[in-house]
Structures are given as C-alpha cells and as structure tokens.
C-alpha cells in the first residue's frame, strides 16, 4: 500500500487563472510518498519544457539526499528518437523507471524498501543534442518508509560494582516504544526511549541494574506491530551467562 500526500495549494497571491506551464520548464512531484518496508513505492515526477517536439538525446536522473549535488541512485539515457531509456545506473538494482521521459514522465519505482531509503529524492532531466538544457526538482519528494518494530540487539553488560545492566535496541517507523519486563520488575516496566543520534529509526532502552537472575524481556511496539526478545541472567561465581 503506497500513500501519496496530495497538497492542496493555498495560493494566496491572487485569483488569476495561470497560463499553461507548457512553454516553461517545470516539475511536478508530490511532497511525500509513504510505503512499508519490504514493499515497493512509486515516486511520481512529471515535467514540462519549452523545447516543443524535442526528439534528441536525453538523460533521466534521480538523486537522493539533496538536490543538484546528492548521490545518483538511478540514471538512464535515451538516444535520439528512441522511447527506450536505457538504464545506466540503478543502485542495488532496486530502482526502475516507470514513466516515459519522452512523454514528460520520470516516475520511478523503488523495490524492496528498507528504512534506510527514507529520505528525499530529486528527479532531473537533461537534454543534449541540438538543445542543451536541464532541469531538476528543487524540493523533491520525501519517501517515508514505515516499518513494524524489529529488535536489532539485546544484551547484558557488566557495570561497576559487580552489577549488570541490560540494553535493548530496536528499529521501526514510527520509532517504537520500548518496555522491559523481568524478575522483580513488575509487568512491562516502561523504559526511557532514546533515539540514537544520526539513527532516527533506532531506539535504545537500558535497564540499569539487574538485581535478580532470570529472564528479562524487551518489547518494542509501534502502530504497525510489536516484537519481543529476551535475555537470561545467571550469576555463578561472579560471572554471567546470557543468551537470547
């Protein structure tokens, strides 16, 4: 299921009917497209240009992160008169042109979405031949990738004074709420969420002092689902054994 946010333009400058954009460069992209991790998403991008009946060589490009300078994730080239845009770059083979650049459509399909794909994408078209011209979307389209929680790490670590602490790190979007349960903790003790710097989808919760042996369970939950993982603490001769 792919969701595209349609923006209702609040044009507060005046009520004049605008002349057709067909004689100018312009690009139309939605502000945002949403899809779940593992699914595919379509990033729509259409354009208009001033070069009537242009039939020369063209290149379609999509880049990620920032306009004009971000890394390319997809590039294809069409020869003069050709409707086929030959793929020259498709990062990890997951990007595929759905649109026909000859018909002013650069729409892109992204397969097997991962949380790391959650960023902005910018479409660009370049004309080469008799006409040398290019245009790129400035604000781009934000690909919002959602994902059910997944616990990526759970561990028991030694802490000062022969004590132990437990760490649980989960990923998901929306970022999951984490809770610990275990011996003498009561049922589902809520832990403080702490999204890690630079890892917007990762959340870590710490149980600072494990006072009893036994099974400690971390539960991660968001609107798309929940995930659990456990770690076991057995203290013998001042050592700990932990397994998940």
């Amino acid at each position: 299921f792919v969701r595209t946010k349609i923006d209702t333009t609040e044009n507060l400058l005046n009520t004049e009917v605008h002349s057709s954009p067909a004689q100018r460069w312009s690009m139309q992209v939605p502000p945002e497209v949403s899809a779940e991790a593992g699914d595919a998403a379509v990033l729509p991008c259409t354009f208009t240009h001033p070069h009537r009946h242009y039939d020369g060589p063209l290149t379609a490009i999509w880049r990620a992160g920032e306009p004009y300078a971000g890394p390319q994730v997809f590039r294809c080239a069409a020869a003069r008169g050709s409707e086929l845009c030959q793929t020259a770059l498709s990062l990890h083979g997951r990007f595929r042109l759905l649109g026909n650049p000859r018909r002013n459509d650069l729409s892109l399909r992204v397969e097997r979405l991962a949380l790391a794909d959650d960023r902005r994408y910018f479409c660009r078209v370049e004309f080469a031949g008799d006409v040398h011209d290019r245009y790129e979307s400035r604000h781009g389209v934000r690909l919002h990738v959602t994902a059910a929680p997944r616990i990526v790490n759970i561990s028991v670590l030694p802490s000062p004074a022969h004590a132990f602490r437990a760490l649980c790190t989960a990923e998901g979007e929306p970022p999951p709420a984490l809770a610990w349960s275990g011996p003498a903790l009561g049922n589902s003790l809520a832990a403080v969420r702490s999204p890690r710097e630079g890892h917007g989808h990762l959340v870590t919760a710490e149980l600072p002092a494990l006072t009893h042996d036994g099974r400690y369970t971390c539960t991660a939950a968001n609107s798309l689902g929940r995930s659990e993982a456990s770690v076991y603490l057995f203290r013998f001769h001042g050592a700990s054994g932990a397994s998940t």
């Epitope: 923006d7 333009t9 609040e10 044009n11 507060l12 400058l13 605008h18 002349s19 954009p21 100018r24 460069w25 312009s26 690009m27 139309q28 992209v29 939605p30 502000p31 945002e32 208009t48 306009p67 004009y68 902005r120 011209d133 245009y135 979307s137 400035r138 604000h139 781009g140 389209v141 934000r142």
Partner: antibody
Framework: EVQLQQSGTELVRPGSSVKISCKAS????????MDWVKQRPGQGLEWIGE????????NYNQKFKGKATLTVDKFSRTAYMELSSLTSEDSAVYYC?????????????????WGQGTLVTVSA | ENVLTQSPAIMSASPGEKVTISCSAS?????MYWYQQKPGSSPKPWIY???NLASGVPARFSGSGSGTSYSLTISSMEAEDAATYYC?????????FGAGTKLELK
C-alpha cells in the same frame, strides 16, 4: 490572515552566536517552506536557505553553510535561524519569508509573505 | 550560481512616464519573480511566475520575458511606485536575487 512575526533587534559581540525567531500564524505551518533572507544596510537581498517544517529538511546557500543553522518547532509554529561566529559582516536585517506551495516547482509563487525583519548588529 | 544582473541600477521617471526595468540571468530560468521594497519596510511580492501580479499590485505593472531575459514594466509612472525593485530566480541552487533597481520620482 497570514503573519510572520520576528523577534526583536539584537546587539551582539563578535565571535558570539545569536538565534532569531519567526512565529507563523494564519496558515498550515507544515505545508509551506520557510526561507531566510539577509539584507545588509543599503544593500540587496541575499538568500540564506530554506527549511521544510514538516520534517525539518534544509537546503542552504553554500555561502551560509556553517554560518546559519535553520530549525523549526512545529508545536509553537516557529522557525529559528542561529548565526554563529559573528563578525561585522553579519550585521544586517534578516527576514523570514514564506515560500509558495509545498513542493511542485510550478506551483511556487515566490515569497508571498515576509516577516518584518530582525536587525542584528555585531559590535564590540 | 545563476547571477541576475538588473539594469539600470538607479533611474528616475516622471509621473505618467513608461518605465522598464530589466533583469538578465547568467543562465536560463523558468520564471522570474519581482519584489518591491521601500525604505524601512520588508520586501513585498510584486510579480510572480514572470507575468502574474501579486494581490493588490496596480494593473499598470506588467512582467514579461523568458530564458535569460526578463523585465518589469510600469505603463504610467505614479509617485507611489518610487521604490527599489528586485528580481529573483528559483530555477537553480542557490536561489538568487538581482542587486536591485532603485526607481525614483523625477
């Protein structure tokens, strides 16, 4: 009625930082980008950068990268610009300006609304 | 960056006179935007997407152009038109303004 209300005049020391604010009202804050523009006394306009309040994505003029940091607080509907390592060259009026429609290049209408400006004076 | 060159930098016009302010871009742009600014005030949107008048702008103003050459025209100068006018492009990074044309009343 759309309004952009900026914080007041700032007199700051060289080398220090200043954070100026722009409170938006009268429209859906997250639907429009917010831009910042610099105008030195008697001079023209210079674009600093822009921020999308919906996700805090920023796009800077390379010249101001490292000098200006743009942020927003969605809940208070306020955009901020922090200027660091101030010198006399940073003495100027700074405007926030609301960009046109959200994303499509064709629907961009220029800066439809401007704040009243914040005068920043850098002086020892 | 796309440099916008406005001409003239300063000009004066008599009431009723036709005025044309030019803005030349160092590389092609899709649309040009114009702002009016008076001393002590914020810039005001004046013309957007090359030829559309912003709300409240008198019909004696018009805008035209394409590619690298754009202009703002006042068909008949009035006293309230005395101000500085800036052109601006949005087609490439960074967004740039012209240096301004100061229009004075003769």
């Amino acid at each position: 009625e759309v309004q952009l209300q900026q914080s007041g005049t700032e007199l700051v020391r060289p080398g220090s930082s200043v954070k100026i604010s722009c409170k938006a009202s009268g429209y859906t804050f997250t639907r429009y980008w917010m831009d910042w523009v610099k105008q030195r006394p008697g001079q023209g306009l210079e674009w600093i950068g822009e921020i999308d309040p919906s996700d805090s994505y920023t796009n800077y003029n390379q010249k101001f990268k490292g000098k200006a940091t743009l942020t927003v607080d969605k809940f208070s509907r306020t955009a901020y610009m922090e200027l660091s390592s101030l010198t006399s060259e940073d003495s100027a009026v700074y405007y926030c300006a609301r960009s046109g429609a959200y994303s499509s290049d064709y629907s961009y209408d220029g800066f439809a609304y401007w704040g009243q400006g914040t005068l920043v004076t850098v002086s020892a | 960056e796309n440099v916008l060159t406005q001409s003239p930098a300063i000009m004066s016009a008599s009431p009723g006179e036709k005025v044309t302010i030019s803005c030349s871009a160092s590389s092609s742009v899709s649309y040009m935007y114009w702002y009016q600014q008076k001393p002590g005030s914020s810039p005001k949107p004046w013309i957007y997407r090359t030829s559309n008048l912003a709300s409240g702008v008198p019909a004696r103003f018009s805008g035209s152009g394409s590619g690298t050459s754009y202009s703002l025209t006042i068909s008949s100068m009035e006293a309230e038109d005395a101000a500085t006018y800036y052109c601006q492009q949005w087609s490439s990074n960074p967004l740039t303004f012209g240096a301004g044309t100061k229009l004075e009343l003769k």
